[in-house]
């Protein structure tokens, strides 16, 4: 794959992943739950990072933000922070990578500068993807832990007799946002890796212009006037490197045959 294609594909994959991270962060369906059920109506609950919604089988839906709520899990704040950091790094990564794209010419920016910017954006995308994956995984773990804990302490106080509180065991599932977040984080990470790989191809390799090494297959090497290389061994496979005007091109793996200059 060409450097431009690798860089471009990495950018597109990261962009899709980044959009997914934003979508996941904004989505309300991080977890879903049955809150209430009877033969007539059912109340479903879906919760996001910012608000919780109830939807009834009758069609009634109501969402409420967490602003005034005390006692939210501390891990929720950590997940929010991780997702926001992921988005911020993604934004910076996109801005940097736009200028780094080989197919876009900006002023007199040379390949060395573009390579550095490509590497920078790649690293930013990798960290952004990791933040999203960790954030979503922490939330999933928090969900499982909290539900296990509250189920273990299901009855507190006389099994729910008068004046007491009883924890209700309900079915819960991971919401769509978790899967969106995992996939998006993975795509951003992959895109970032591709950008880093593309950076290696963008780095100008000056070694081709500085020196060309000569190798002979035999031990005794003699040079005759005229610049020909002589070696021992008839019909042995020597690696002749002939320098052309281009300076950077070499010709490898040619079969050498005995000539009048070879020693026998």
């Amino acid at each position: 794959m060409s450097v431009t294609a690798c860089q471009g594909l990495g950018f597109v994959v990261s962009l899709i992943g980044f959009a997914g991270i934003i979508a996941a962060t904004c989505m309300d369906q991080w977890s879903t739950q049955d809150l209430y059920n009877n033969p007539v109506t059912a109340v479903f609950n879906y919760q996001g990072l910012w608000r919780s919604c109830v939807r009834e089988s009758s069609g009634f839906t109501e969402c409420r933000g967490y602003f005034t709520l005390l006692g939210l899990p501390a891990m929720l704040q950590a997940v929010r922070a991780l997702m926001i950091v992921g988005i911020v790094l993604g934004v910076i990564g996109i801005l940097v990578s736009i200028f780094a794209l080989k197919c876009i010419r900006i002023g007199s920016m040379d390949d060395s500068a573009k390579a550095k910017m490509t590497l920078t954006s790649g690293i930013l995308f990798i960290i952004s993807g990791i933040c999203a994956i960790i954030g979503v995984s922490v939330f999933a773990n928090m969900l499982v832990t909290n539900f296990w804990m509250s189920t273990a302490n299901m009855y507190s106080g006389m099994g729910g007799m008068g004046g007491m509180v009883q924890t209700v065991q309900t079915r819960y599932t991971f919401g769509a946002a978790l899967f969106v977040g995992w996939v998006a984080g993975g795509l951003t990470l992959i895109g970032g890796v591709m950008m880093c790989i593309a950076c290696r191809g963008l780095t100008p390799d000056d070694s081709n212009f500085k020196a060309v090494s000569y190798h002979a297959s035999g031990q005794n090497v003699a040079y005759r006037p005229g610049g020909f290389k002589a070696s021992t061994g008839f019909g042995s496979n020597t690696r002749n490197k002939k320098i052309y005007d281009g300076g950077a091109r070499t010709e490898d793996d040619e079969q050498s045959h005995p000539t009048k200059y070879d020693y026998v």
Epitope: V43, E62, V165, Q169
Partner: nanobody, 120 residues
Framework: EVQVQESGGGLVQPGGSLRLSCAAS????????MGWYRQAPGSQRELVAT???????YYADSMKGRSTISRDNAKNTVYLQMNSLKPEDTAVYYC??????????????WGHGTQVTVSS
């Protein structure tokens, strides 16, 4: 913590009417549903009627057509209007409040109960 307080119980003659009230107070995220249960001496607690936040109602067969449940979301209060009362309706009536707890299982809060006696 959520406090649940019932009121409106008392002695009523057969065929009479009674209106029970239940108010929830305290700090909580959101009430999902409120309802009334009753427990007669020597028997298990049974559902009378429930109402969800959206206003969907459910009545036990024993009270269908004879009772109406309503609620005031702003006041976190639920009402049970019972008509054509029979002696078998005699029981302690408990108010139930189901509260949503974000990222946890929901909690059911119960009142201490109000006595309803149907007797001539």
């Amino acid at each position: 913590e959520v406090q649940v307080q019932e009121s409106g119980g008392g002695l009523v003659q057969p065929g009479g009417s009674l209106r029970l009230s239940c108010a929830a107070s305290g700090s909580f995220f959101r009430i999902v549903a409120m309802g009334w249960y009753r427990q007669a001496p020597g028997s298990q607690r049974e559902l009378v009627a429930t109402i969800t936040r959206g206003g969907s109602t459910y009545y036990a067969d024993s009270m269908k057509g004879r009772s109406t449940i309503s609620r005031d979301n702003a006041k976190n209060t639920v009402y049970l209007q019972m008509n054509s009362l029979k002696p078998e309706d005699t029981a302690v009536y408990y108010c139930n409040v189901r509260v949503e707890v974000p990222f946890m299982q929901p909690n059911d809060y119960w009142g201490h109960g109000t006595q309803v006696t149907v007797s001539s």
